[in-house]
Every structure is written in C-alpha cells, then in structure tokens.
C-alpha cells in the first residue's frame, strides 16, 4: 500500500517551508507558480492529483532531492517538463496521455536499468507505457489518453 | 546480505567526546534514496532518534542534541560516523544504526529495515 | 515534536489470544508509523511500515492498521515468541519519534 497523508487545510502559501515527508495538495485547483521552487527538502512523496494542471514549471520541482514519487493523476498534462523526466530515480504517477512521449524517451536515453515505466488509464488500471504509447500515439493518430483497450497490468 | 555494525569506546567520562562508527555491508549509501539514522535506547526506556544522513551528504538531526551532534560518512569503506560532545550521564545508552533503504517498488516510504545490533556507551566519571 | 503515546505500558496475555497495542500521534502524521519488535538484549526489528504493510518474512498472524492519528498492531494468535517489546515511530515529520513501548508478557 502506498503511504499516504492529509492535505494542508488551509490555502496553500508558496512561500511556506514545508517540512513534513509526505505533502498532499490533491484536488485543490492549484496552479503552480512559474519561477518560484516548491520548498520541501524532506519531501519523499508529492501528491499533485487532480489539479487541472497542463504545465510543470520545471522551477516548482528544482529543490525537491528527496522526491521519489510525483503523483500527478487526473491533471490533463500536455508535456512533461525533460528536466523533471530526467530525474531517473523519480516515480511519475500519470494518466496515459500521448504527452508522456517526452518522458518516456528522456527516460530511455538517460536512465539505464530502470524498471518499466507504467501508465494510469480512466479505470485506475496501471498499463506499459511504452505499450500505450505504440498503440495509441503512433503518427498519424489523434491525441489519446487511457481508454482501458490495452492490456492490464497488476 | 544486509547488515550494520555499531562500535563505540564503551566508556567515556563527562565532558568528552563520545564518537561511534557504523561499518555496513550489502548496499551503498550511494544509491539515491539510501540512508542511515542513529538511534539510541536508555537501559529500560524507549528509542530516540539522533540523526540521519542521506546519499547525498544531506544530514538531518534531533534539534534537541543539534548543538553537540556532528555527522559525517565515508562512502568508499561503508562507513558511518557520529560524535556527540560534552557527553553527560543521560547519554548512557545503548546506540543503534539503522538503514533507511530506497523501495524499488512504491517509493515514499520510510523506515529502517535493518539495524545494528547496538553498542552500549556509559558515562561515568 | 510529534508526541507518540503508546498504550497500554504492558499486558500478559495467553498463548493463542489475541493481542491489540495502540499508538497515538499528537498531530496528523498520515500513514507514516512503524511497528518493531525488541526481544530481550536484541536489537529492534521491523514488523510493519506504513502503518498496514506487513514487512518481508514477518508472520501474517502481526498486523498493523491506521492513519492520521490513531495507529493499531494487532496479534491475532499470540505466541510464546512473541514475548518483545513493541515499538512505534512516526517518520512523516522531523525529529522522527518513537512511543515509549509496550511490553508483551505470556502468562
């Protein structure tokens, strides 16, 4: 089971020192600030989830050495920052979506023996992304996202 | 096969300085995620928590003991070191190493999986 | 500092009972407390992170449940080798702290 936490109850203050290691900011409707670095150095888990988010300023994640899962579910992302895809040892929870091609290449030419990388479709089953992404973003097809047509994996 | 390994002078006297290593095998503090705390236990009472250090040389400490508290590793020999100054009577305990490893799978979590067997430290004058 | 409050200080129970210890945070520390055991003259040992994920070998008889503040191990079918001391440790906030332990005695 993953760990999991409680989010803040009041409004979100960037400029607040967060020093627990787990931080829970799901379904806030946040929009994250460009220039501004999330300050959480202790941080192991950051929960993101359902935030509407399209963009990952890639200055909001540049002090979080400690980060090791990103859960970024139920944002309609359109890419994934080559900075933050490069962090090899980061685990990026995220619905399949045609925008993960860049983190998923990034990751295959800079991160050697890495276990596989999965996918989220609407349904919460975990698929390959690379399998998705062969079936669903070859060129020419239309910008997809998790559909439950490939196959599961537990 | 993991495991840590506590030595310590056994006993010092008031006022000096008690330094401990932790000597480990089966992982390297190297890779990301991976570290190790010190922990100490008072004959008869609970577990307290002294610091801790991380892969990358990031160390973290009791804001209780922080003053007298000094972290440093060797990465090359797998080694761990603490020095606690000024040392009193209430540091008698026995002292533990601890590793926090990294998940392959799930990360996020965090405890220590395995511990030293302790070694036990008395100040008396 | 989060303040964990271990209960009760100790209890004797009989081979084949079943055993509850309970751990209480002073604040809201998610899923993030360990279990360990310590028998006599031992060092502490593992038995449950993230307050329900049994840890590798540990019998399936321990288990751990809760979150936020309230945190429950349970032993379902206590036996004699489980005669320790029972620890746990939030790990969501530094300092890191630990309750003060229950002792298990078998009658």
């Known amino acids: 089971q993953e760990p999991s936490c409680t989010m803040p109850s009041t409004d979100v203050d960037w400029n607040t020192e967060f020093s627990a290691t787990c931080l829970n900011f799901s379904g806030r409707g946040l929009s994250l600030p460009l220039n501004q670095s999330l300050r959480a150095s202790n941080v192991l888990l950051l929960d993101l989830s359902g935030n509407g988010l399209r963009e990952l300023p890639v200055t909001f994640f540049a002090h979080l050495q400690k980060l090791e899962v990103l859960n970024l579910l139920h944002n309609p992302l359109s890419r994934v920052d080559g900075a933050l895809a490069a962090r090899c040892d980061l685990d990026l929870r995220a619905d399949c979506s045609c925008a993960l091609e860049s983190w998923h290449e990034v990751r295959r030419d800079n991160c050697s023996g890495q276990k596989p990388l999965l996918c989220w479709d609407t349904t919460s089953f975990q698929h390959n992304l690379s399998a998705f992404l062969e079936v669903s973003c070859a060129p020419g097809l239309a910008p997809a996202t998790g559909s439950g047509h490939h196959h599961h994996h537990h | 096969q993991v495991t840590l390994k506590e030595s310590g002078p056994g006993i010092l006297q008031p006022s000096q300085t008690l330094s401990l290593t932790c000597s480990f095998s089966?992982?390297?503090?190297?890779?990301?995620?991976?570290?190790v705390s010190w922990i100490r236990q008072p004959s008869g009472k609970g577990l307290e928590w002294l610091a801790h250090?991380?892969?990358?040389?990031?160390?973290r400490y009791n804001p209780s003991l922080k003053s007298r508290l000094t972290l440093s590793k060797d990465t090359s020999s797998n080694q761990v070191f603490l020095k606690i100054t000024s040392v009193d009577t209430a540091d008698t305990a026995t002292y533990y190493c601890?590793?926090?490893?990294?998940?392959?799978?799930?990360?996020?979590?965090?405890?220590?999986?395995?511990w030293g067997a302790g070694t036990t430290v008395t100040v008396s004058s | 500092d989060i303040v964990m409050t271990q209960s009760p200080k100790s209890m004797s129970m009989s081979v084949g009972e079943r055993v509850t210890l309970t751990c209480k945070a002073s604040?809201?520390?998610?899923?993030?407390v360990s279990w360990y055991q310590q028998k006599a003259e031992q060092s502490p040992k593992l038995l449950i992170y993230?307050?329900?994920n049994r840890y590798t070998g540990v019998p399936d008889r321990f288990t751990g449940s809760g979150s936020a503040t309230d945190f429950t191990l349970t032993i379902s079918n206590v036996q004699t080798e489980d005669l320790a001391d029972y620890h746990c440790?939030?790990?969501?906030?530094?300092?890191?702290?630990f309750g003060s332990g229950t002792k298990l005695e078998i009658k």
């Open positions: 993230g307050a329900s």
């Open positions: 250090i991380y892969w990358d040389d990031d160390k």
């Open positions: 089966g992982f390297s503090l190297s890779t990301s995620g991976m570290g």
């Open positions: 604040e809201n520390v998610g899923t993030y």
């Open positions: 440790g939030q790990s969501y906030s530094y300092p890191f702290t």
């Open positions: 601890a590793r926090r490893p990294r998940d392959y799978y799930g990360g996020g979590h965090w405890y220590f999986d395995v």
